[in-house]
């Protein structure tokens, strides 16, 4: 466990004559605040994915009013650091997004208005416990200068905050198998504290609070022997009685979400859905009012003038959650008809239609046959954006302009000879065969496997195919 710390040094216009006007004016005084979002750096997450490592909101900066005629200076900043606590190991490589927000303090109806001034992002390698790393980034006409570091919370140490340290019990040396804790040489590396009750014989841990089982043992505390008998249900009946294998502790076990938040598992970790009035990775931030600007992504905050009365975030299209922190996967509703591809552009939904379909939701079937003529008595058939002609007998091709050779496919079986005919084809069957395609053998006694031939047609006669 540990804390990521971000220090904003300055936010102001970039160099050069095209410097931006101050974001505040005498008529509209304003103040700045910052938001940081952290994600594991090498995750294959989409840009809109939640801040899996955590997020933080700064306090508000001092109120600033532009001095008429003066160039926009660096703007006054909030006091203190932005701190993002992390519970698990520090990943070493992380991605960040830092947003600079302006809060206008004019006489808006419904309270202050917020707007995003600048957003910077990056991916960096950073060892916990190292020195402050500095950065300078441009965002539009603005320039942001900041420093950041990750530090472990005692007793954790190390570049990933996974080793634990305890004060030495003896003045001279550490216990058996335990090394001194660099750089805290007066402390010793502590044995990991596994989940309470974890079997000392059959369980072990690589991180504090976990309980991993040796082969042949299962259960949350590794006290249940794995039996070879089959389980009756997918999870198995009560593992304590049968010894069936059950899934190990999940990320939501013990509900890491505080303040009544509900936990849902994600592919990599967990996500807390917080009740109104709370937010943060584990719903740990409370006493929030609209003055704290809790609504992200342009959400409008209503109510909550004092910490006891909850606020409500009215989210813009495409966002949801008590703080508008979750992007709605609007494509999951499959709004595009007729096989169209759905694109969520954030500000709007777009459907990329398959050929032959149009409209905002690909709902219009284009008339493929409009102005298309099929020759020689063929009829036009619509389908999937391409017109097709169903041709009259004896004709083929895309527009039924080609005279078809009905014998090209060798339709006469058993050596029968094919003759093209104005209304189709005729098969002259070889001795011993009959039928429209010479498909039936004639029995030696002269009887046919078919019902009696129509009058005037003897077995062996050419059978005309109508």
């Amino acid at each position: 466990a540990g804390v990521f710390e971000l220090q904003i040094h300055s936010f102001g216009p970039g160099p050069g004559p095209g410097a931006p006007r101050s974001p505040c004016s005498a008529r509209l005084p304003c103040r700045l605040f910052f938001r940081v979002c952290l994600k594991p750096g090498l995750s294959e997450e989409a840009a809109e994915s939640p801040c899996a490592l955590g997020a933080a909101l700064s306090a508000r900066g001092p109120v600033y009013t532009e001095q008429p005629g003066a160039p926009a200076p660096d703007l006054p900043l909030p006091d203190g650091l932005l701190q993002v606590p992390f519970r698990d190991a520090w990943p070493g490589t992380f991605s960040f997004i830092i947003e600079t927000w302006r809060e206008e303090l004019g006489d808006q109806i419904g309270g202050p208005a917020w707007s995003l001034l600048a957003r910077v992002a990056g991916r960096r390698r950073l060892a916990a416990g190292g020195p402050w790393a500095r950065d300078i980034q441009r965002a539009g006409a603005w320039e942001l200068r900041f420093s950041y570091r990750a530090r472990c919370e005692p007793p954790a140490v190390g570049t990933a905050c996974t080793r634990l340290c305890r004060p030495r019990s003896a003045p001279s040396r550490c216990g058996p198998g335990l090394r001194p804790c660099a750089p805290l040489e007066d402390e010793c590396e502590a044995p990991l504290v596994c989940r309470a009750g974890c079997s000392p014989e059959h369980g072990f841990c690589e991180q504090p609070g976990e309980c991993r089982c040796l082969e042949g043992w299962t259960g949350p505390l590794c006290t249940v022997p794995v039996s070879t008998s089959s389980c009756l249900s997918p999870r198995g009946p009560s593992s304590a009685t049968t010894g069936c294998l059950v899934p190990g502790p999940g990320p939501c076990d013990g509900n890491p979400c505080a303040n009544g938040g509900s936990c849902s598992e994600t592919p990599r970790s967990f996500e807390c859905t917080c009740p109104r009035g709370f937010y943060g990775l584990r719903c740990e931030v409370s006493g929030v009012t609209c003055a704290d600007g809790p609504c992200f992504n342009g959400g409008l905050c209503v109510g909550g003038a004092d910490p006891d009365s909850a606020y409500i975030c009215h989210c813009p299209p495409g966002f949801q959650g008590s703080n508008c922190e979750k992007r709605v996967d609007r494509c999951s509703l499959q709004p595009c008809r007729n096989g169209g591809l759905c694109l969520d552009l954030g500000h709007a939904l777009r459907c990329r239609c398959r050929a032959g379909f149009a409209g905002p939701r690909c709902e219009h079937d284009l008339d493929d046959c409009a102005g298309r003529a099929c020759a020689n008595g063929g009829t036009c058939v619509e389908g999937g954006g391409a017109h097709r002609c169903s041709c009259a007998l004896g004709f083929g091709g895309r527009d039924c302009r080609e005279r078809a050779d009905p014998c090209a496919a060798r339709p006469c079986a058993h050596g029968g000879r094919c003759y093209a005919h104005f209304s189709g084809l005729v098969c002259a069957c070889a001795p011993g065969y009959m039928g429209a395609r010479c498909e039936f053998p004639v029995h030696p006694d002269g009887a046919s496997a078919l019902p009696a031939a129509p009058p005037g047609l003897r077995p062996g006669d050419p059978q005309r195919y109508l």
Epitope: P15, A46, R123, R124, R134, I136
Partner: antibody, heavy 117, light 107 residues
Framework: QVQLVQSGAEVKKPGASVKVSCKAS????????IHWIRQAPGQGLEWMGY????????EFNQNFHDRVTMTRDTSTSTVYMELSSLRSEDTAVYYC??????????WGQGTTVTVSS | AIQLTQSPSSLSASVGDRVTITCRAS??????LAWYQQKPGKAPKLLIY???SLEDGVPSRFSGSGSGTDFTLTISSLQPEDFATYFC?????????FGGGTKLEIK
């Protein structure tokens, strides 16, 4: 106006070292980083690393990590880049550039380094 | 390191033409892309940073767009002084990397 002026062309033998200077003027020297970028003949651009003149913190491209050194002299607003153990493939034009992590807004005129036996 | 693929690698056009050069990143780099112009024997010059911000002093006929993995540099009406090589550069991850360049020549 902002200017970055680099030292003159160099011809070196394989195995030797070269030290290129970059003198900054027209702005507060410690306010921006100085990056080094090189361009081999007819090739693209390759970032080598940067120095923060305030803290003397340096960060390098792994391709050069063990061969490059960057230093600065605040009294003359000059940054130096030294590349050791030169080989023929180090023949290139070496540029210094002012900037932060996501922009290089002013560049020096370039220094041609030729490595030949 | 993040790879940037520029296309086309060379392009012939006439004065007054509208020209588009594209740059594709091997992974999401948000809006951390810059465009540079380089003329023979000269240092590169910054044109666009953070995908669409025009550097001071750069003519407004140059514009940048895109975010994520796909980016575009557009010159709305080519001028004689625009014939040069153009490079894109990502600054999301360390080390910063450059595209292979697009050489814009007079037709």
């Amino acid at each position: 106006q902002v200017q970055l002026v680099q030292s003159g062309a160099e011809v070196k033998k394989p195995g030797a070292s070269v030290k290129v200077s970059c003198k900054a003027s027209g702005y507060t020297f410690t306010r921006y980083w100085i990056h080094w970028i090189r361009q081999a003949p007819g090739q693209g651009l390759e970032w080598m690393g940067y120095i923060n003149p305030t803290t003397v913190y340096t960060e390098f491209n792994q391709n050069f990590h063990d061969r490059v050194t960057m230093t600065r002299d605040t009294s003359t607003s000059t940054v130096y880049m030294e590349l050791s153990s030169l080989r023929s493939e180090d023949t290139a034009v070496y540029y210094c550039a002012r900037g932060g992590s996501n922009f290089f807004d002013y560049w020096g005129q370039g220094t041609t380094v030729t490595v030949s036996s | 390191a993040i790879q940037l693929t520029q296309s086309p690698s060379s392009l012939s056009a006439s004065v007054g033409d509208r020209v588009t050069i594209t740059c594709r990143a091997s992974e999401n780099i948000y809006y951390n892309l810059a465009w540079y112009q380089q003329k023979p024997g000269k240092a590169p010059k910054l044109l666009i940073y953070t995908a669409n911000s025009l550097e001071d002093g750069v003519p407004s006929r140059f514009s940048g767009s895109g975010s994520g993995t796909d980016f575009t540099l557009t010159i709305s009406s080519l001028q004689p002084e625009d014939f040069a090589t153009y490079f894109c550069k990502q600054a999301y991850d360390v080390p910063p990397t450059f595209g292979g360049g697009t050489k814009l020549e007079i037709k």
